[in-house]
């Protein structure tokens, strides 16, 4: 359905508030270093222009594509060359190359200061003084730090952010009301950003076939009562939505996401019995609710999977007629029967099944050949089951902090070339899998754990792509999306790594250590642990534990001292010398 003016079409569909919010997000995700005021100015100019097009779709420039309009606007920024360097060269290109160029310059790890949370009274005053600016600032700050954040979902976060301030700034104890809500939004926001980053990586690095396979598996688990044709329709629509958002087409993405929510709510009976409570909610909340909806119950009396996909003599005929449809149906049938499997495992099984059919359908006796597919599946299923069991036992034994430390050591030994901040960030997040998943019943552990690990490892891949330092990481990240986690799990100590020279400065600490929050103290200690392993990659667990225990004791002692700085200056070198001796 074509429109004379695309910008007018989207403005009318989305409404002014959402239109402005999405344009601000789009601009902030592209030009991550620009000041807030500059973005607000650009957004206001685009909005005023959109209004002229709504009034008269034939007005000058109203027929231009959104990429052309937005790109032209971004290229008016005066300091583009000074602030962004070679990104300014994008402006010499024509669409669609210009937009592709902007996309390639999105920075997953922008050099931006961490967001500092002001005092509650200061925030409440700012909220009351100018609510609109306060909320725009939130969108801007999140979007520029998370350039692939799912834009329509960010509008939902902003709505919750607004609601939290509206409620808590009137409460008797503002801080007690507000701070837990802000913590929750921050944690949920980081998780949402990381999940979306994996979707975009899947689409951009492995193509829409990979994303569609993921979506078939996940939606079949969620909607096991839905027919294959229904799941396929949802997958097609969902792929379009995420392709648009990952491609920077945020207005189209939000519009199509709203259409998808509308469709799902109008067709609940043929999708899932769990959608009812979502469909009564307002748009942003409804879309979020639908995305997070729990799995429906498995239908009674599902027929044998083996009958159609192994025992039937028509397997090769059906496969040859429409390979992707047949494999899609296999994945759908397998996934709807297995809510207890991770999506990544289901995709590995589908891949193994495909490889078996490719081999066997060319064999003398295809049926006898593909009957052996069962033997190939068992180790694929048991590997993540065993991994989850072992790591949950370790987590329960150690607790989160020490479990993170075990993973820090494990991953530093695997890929010691990776930067210390990246190893600390990724290992800390890998370690959070314990608290997130190990408390769940057995049937929910694997999907929780492995699919979460896929998200965290994607962060490692994305950061490593920006500054590649390890062939092993590149190999695990690029060879196969579904085998990333098993690839990293299989890595051993890097024997070729030349240990890092000892640098006393790395292990020099000061009194400021004592004023850090518990989390910041942990990060400091974990940074030292990574550096220790890089220096002595063959150090045993016992040796490392001894050093870390001494470190904790040394910090505790000096933080209790009257002259803390003097203590650090005196005890620090002793700790370093003792550590070197312990690791010799």
């Amino acid at each position: 359905d074509t429109h004379k003016s695309e910008v007018a079409h989207r403005f009318k569909d989305l409404g002014e508030e959402h239109f402005k919010g999405l344009v601000l997000v789009a601009f902030s995700q592209y030009l991550q270093q620009c000041p807030f005021e500059e973005h607000v100015k650009l957004v206001n100019e685009v909005t005023e222009f959109a209004k002229t097009c709504v009034a008269d779709e034939s007005a000058e420039n109203c027929d231009k594509s959104l990429h052309t309009l937005f790109g032209d606007k971004l290229c008016t920024v005066a300091t583009l060359r000074e602030t962004y360097g070679e990104m300014a060269d994008c402006c010499a290109k024509q669409e669609p190359e210009r937009n592709e160029c902007f996309l390639q310059h999105k920075d997953d790890n922008p050099n931006l200061p961490p967001l500092v949370r002001p005092e509650v009274d200061v925030m409440c005053t700012a909220f009351h003084d100018n609510e609109a600016t306060f909320l725009k600032k939130y969108l801007y700050e999140v979007a520029r730090r998370h350039p692939y954040f799912y834009a329509p979902e960010l509008l939902f976060f902003a709505a919750r952010y607004k609601a939290a301030f509206a409620e808590c700034c009137q409460a008797a104890d503002k801080a007690a009301c507000l701070l837990p809500k802000l913590d929750e939004l921050r944690d949920e926001g980081k998780a949402s950003s990381a999940k979306q980053r994996l979707k975009c990586a899947s689409l951009q690095k492995f193509g829409d076939r990979a994303f569609k396979a993921w979506a078939v598996a996940r939606l079949s688990q969620k909607f096991p009562k839905a027919e294959f044709a229904e799941v396929s329709k949802l997958v097609t629509d969902l792929t379009k939505v995420h392709t648009e958002c990952c491609h920077g087409d945020l207005l189209e993405c939000a519009d199509d996401r709203a259409d998808l929510a509308k469709y799902m709510c109008e067709n609940q009976d043929s999708i899932s019995s769990k959608l009812k409570e979502c469909c009564d909610k307002p748009l942003l909340e409804k879309s979020h609710c639908l995305a997070e909806v729990e799995n429906d119950e498995m239908p009674a009396d599902l027929p044998s999977l083996a009958a159609d996909y192994v025992e039937s003599k028509d397997v090769c005929k059906n496969y040859a007629e429409a390979k992707d449809v047949f494999l899609g149906m296999f994945l759908y049938e397998y996934a709807r029967r297995h809510p207890d499997y991770s999506v990544m495992l289901l995709l590995r099984l589908a891949k193994a099944y495909e490889a078996t059919l490719e081999k066997c359908c060319a064999a003398a006796d295809p049926h006898e050949c593909y009957a052996k597919v069962f033997d190939e599946f068992q180790p694929l299923v048991e590997e993540p089951q065993n991994l989850v069991k072992q790591n949950c036992e370790l987590f329960e034994q150690l607790g989160e902090y020490k479990f993170q430390n075990a993973l820090l050591v494990r991953y530093t030994k695997k890929v010691p070339q990776v930067s210390t901040p990246t190893l600390v960030e990724v290992s800390r997040n890998l370690g959070k899998v314990g608290a997130k998943c190990c408390k769940l019943p057995e049937a929910k552990r694997m999907p929780c754990a492995e699919d979460y690990l896929s998200v965290v490892l994607n962060r490692l891949c994305v950061l490593h792509e920006k500054t590649p330092v390890s062939e092993k990481v590149t190999k695990c990240c690029t060879e196969s999306l579904v085998n990333r986690r098993p690839c990293f799990s299989a890595l051993e100590l890097d024997e070729a790594y030349v240990p890092k020279a000892f640098n006393a400065e790395t292990f020099t600490f000061h009194a400021d250590m004592c004023t850090l929050s518990e989390k910041e103290k942990q990060v400091k200690k974990q940074t030292a642990l990574v550096e220790l392993v890089k220096h002595k990659p063959k150090a045993t667990k016992e040796q490392l534990k001894g050093v870390m225990d001494n470190f904790a004791a040394f910090v505790e002692k000096c933080c209790k001292a009257d002259d803390k700085e003097a203590c650090f200056a005196e005890e620090g070198p002793k700790f370093v010398a003792a550590s070197q001796a312990a690791l010799a």
Partner: nanobody
């Protein structure tokens, strides 16, 4: 990793009934399907019935349809086979089997874990 123990076999007259039970222990969370196979002297092991412990799907060999009923209890990780209208051709060692996936397969290779077997003899 998963142990299966069968019980309930024995000698029965043609036309009689017997109930076989099988209890799984160990890493039972990894089990999805449980089934029964049988092997008569000098013959290959053959599929009898299977059930998906987490749903209510069942599957039977044509030779036992209407006479045998399989039922599973996910909470207790047990499976039972109620055998009615027994005939001498049902004489065999009956094996309980467990699979890590929901295939409801007839092929023994789909099943990762096996019991020791229990003898069922139907006399005429």
């Amino acid at each position: 990793q998963v142990q299966l123990v069968e019980s309930g076999g024995g000698l029965v007259q043609a036309g009689g009934s017997l109930r076989l039970s099988c209890a799984a222990s160990g890493r039972t969370f990894s089990i999805y399907d449980m089934g029964w196979f049988r092997q008569a002297p000098g013959k290959e092991r053959e599929f009898v019935a299977a059930t998906n412990l987490r749903g209510v799907s069942t599957r039977y060999a044509d030779s036992v349809k209407g006479r045998f009923t399989i039922s599973g209890d996910n909470a207790k990780n047990t499976v039972s086979l109620q055998m009615n209208s027994l005939i001498p051709e049902d004489t065999a060692v009956y094996y309980c089997a467990a699979a890590v996936s929901n295939w409801l397969a007839k092929d023994p290779s789909a099943y990762s874990y096996w019991g020791q077997g229990t003898q069922v003899t139907v006399s005429s």
